[in-house]
Amino acid sequence: ETDEESEEPGRRGSFVEMVDNLRGKSGQGYYVEMTVGSPPQTLNILVDTGSSNFAVGAAPHPFLHRYYQRQLSSTYRDLRKGVYVPYTQGKWEGELGTDLVSIPHGPNVTVRANIAAITESDKFFINGSNWEGILGLAYAEIARPDDSLEPFFDSLVKQTHIPNIFSLQLCGAGFPLNQTEALASVGGSMIIGGIDHSLYTGSLWYTPIRREWYYEVIIVRVEINGQDLKMDCKEYNYDKSIVDSGTTNLRLPKKVFEAAVKSIKAASSTEKFPDGFWLGEQLVCWQAGTTPWNIFPVISLYLMGEVTNQSFRITILPQQYLRPVEDVATSQDDCYKFAVSQSSTGTVMGAVIMEGFYVVFDRARKRIGFAVSACHVHDEFRTAAVEGPFVTADMEDCGYNIPQTDESTLMT
């Protein structure tokens, strides 16, 4: 059941003004142009479904071409509160406020939104990425400093008549882009308020959002070239599985990663690849135009469906999980990095997965939809796919329940 025809009014049709409003590349993120303040200050903002803060550079930084100057905005309001966000590597910190925000190639509205003005950061901004801030599109539960800070999308929906849904089409280039090309290239589309049918082929298949914090979903089965990894499905979602446009790779829990690499190695065993390649520490190159895509297997993730005991699968090609990178020394070769990596925080379906699909974040109906992207990179023999239904029993058991750590668990 793809629910294709039962969309509410206002959800159907074309969003011409929003098509092609993203730029960037999977290794450095996809960004949308936004304006902040009065008069409007234009900034490029990373689209991140794996966080919930709208945060922008607000002080000079060697990697920033421009930054938000609060003192120049007549509509800026200081919330007199700081925010500190540490990452595994790096961090950003800043001052909270609100201001008027709009998206030039988005809906024709202006909203007052919370903004974290980043005053200090470490390993956060990326040299040459061309973005100056981050738009966290996930839910309030993971907003910093706490869930009382309303995320941008919540403010947008609350203050306008825009339906509570957005969709992303991230278009991987299939070849590395130098800075000039990256600025000129189309990166994809963020459709705010609905679904654009020109951006996908076939049907949309939906998986429930398990819990509204990250965009958490449940993976029920994993196959490499049709071979089941045969793991307890809880392992696939340990400790969660999320859809995250702000992450480059498909990241898998340690046990799953090891099993998947073993299976991918076996499937591509025509020639031994060094361990450093599978760990993402080495690049592999072929003479331009000769990449033997056929020796690499497809990867299929089965996601819980909307109906009891029903699942569907999304299948990506090596064209998605081998990420094109520039050759160190010469442009005569096509070089790639293995973009599946190990995670200690669960499965992360990052840009390498999303670049195969049009992904619908249907917040109103607490579900995420997948369809084959009209812009995915493929060859004449294989294409990314979204297929179903499949019968899968006991899918609820595949979800991992993270132990509570707050004081309430100590009460008897």
């Epitope: 025509t270 020639e271 690849f273 060094p274 450093g276 390649f277 520490e281 080495q282 690049l283 592999v284 190159c285 072929w286 003479q287 000769t290 033997p292 020796i295 050759d327 160190v328 020394a329 010469t330 070769d333 070089c335």
Partner: nanobody, 121 residues
Framework: DVQLQESGGGSVQAGGSLRLSCAAS????????MGWYRQAPGKERELVST???????SYVDSVKGRFTISQDNAKNTVYLQMNSLKPEDTAKYYC???????????????WGQGTQVTVSS
């Protein structure tokens, strides 16, 4: 697996010299290209110099006439002799290797951890 061991970095006065070396582990198909690139804080990565297995060399314009790349094929080692150093040469220098094609035509690029070169005026 390809392992790279860099050495020779350090601090030096402008006009001074340093010699970087990078030893690579054995690889079945050998190395077709080795070299050095550098990255200064807040700057783009820059390819400094390369040498191919047949001895062909190339240099970025800013180091021509001052830096010399050489190799010892028997030891899978590449050297970068840096003379007349300038403050703008201050950067972390990374060794890289590119293997020759295997039976599938695949070549592998590896890089080291980097060695810091600081040139003061």
């Amino acid at each position: 697996d390809v392992q790279l061991q860099e050495s020779g970095g350090g601090s030096v006065q402008a006009g001074g010299s340093l010699r970087l070396s990078c030893a690579a582990s054995e690889y079945t198909y050998g190395y077709c290209s080795m070299g050095w690139y550098r990255q200064a804080p807040g700057k783009e990565r820059e390819l400094v110099s390369t040498i191919t297995s047949d001895g062909s060399t190339s240099y970025v314009d800013s180091v021509k006439g001052r830096f010399t790349i050489s190799q010892d094929n028997a030891k899978n080692t590449v050297y970068l002799q840096m003379n007349s150093l300038k403050p703008e040469d201050t950067a972390k220098y990374y060794c890289y290797t590119k293997t020759c094609a295997n039976k599938l035509g695949a070549k592998f690029i590896s890089w080291g951890q980097g060695t810091q070169v600081t040139v003061s005026s």
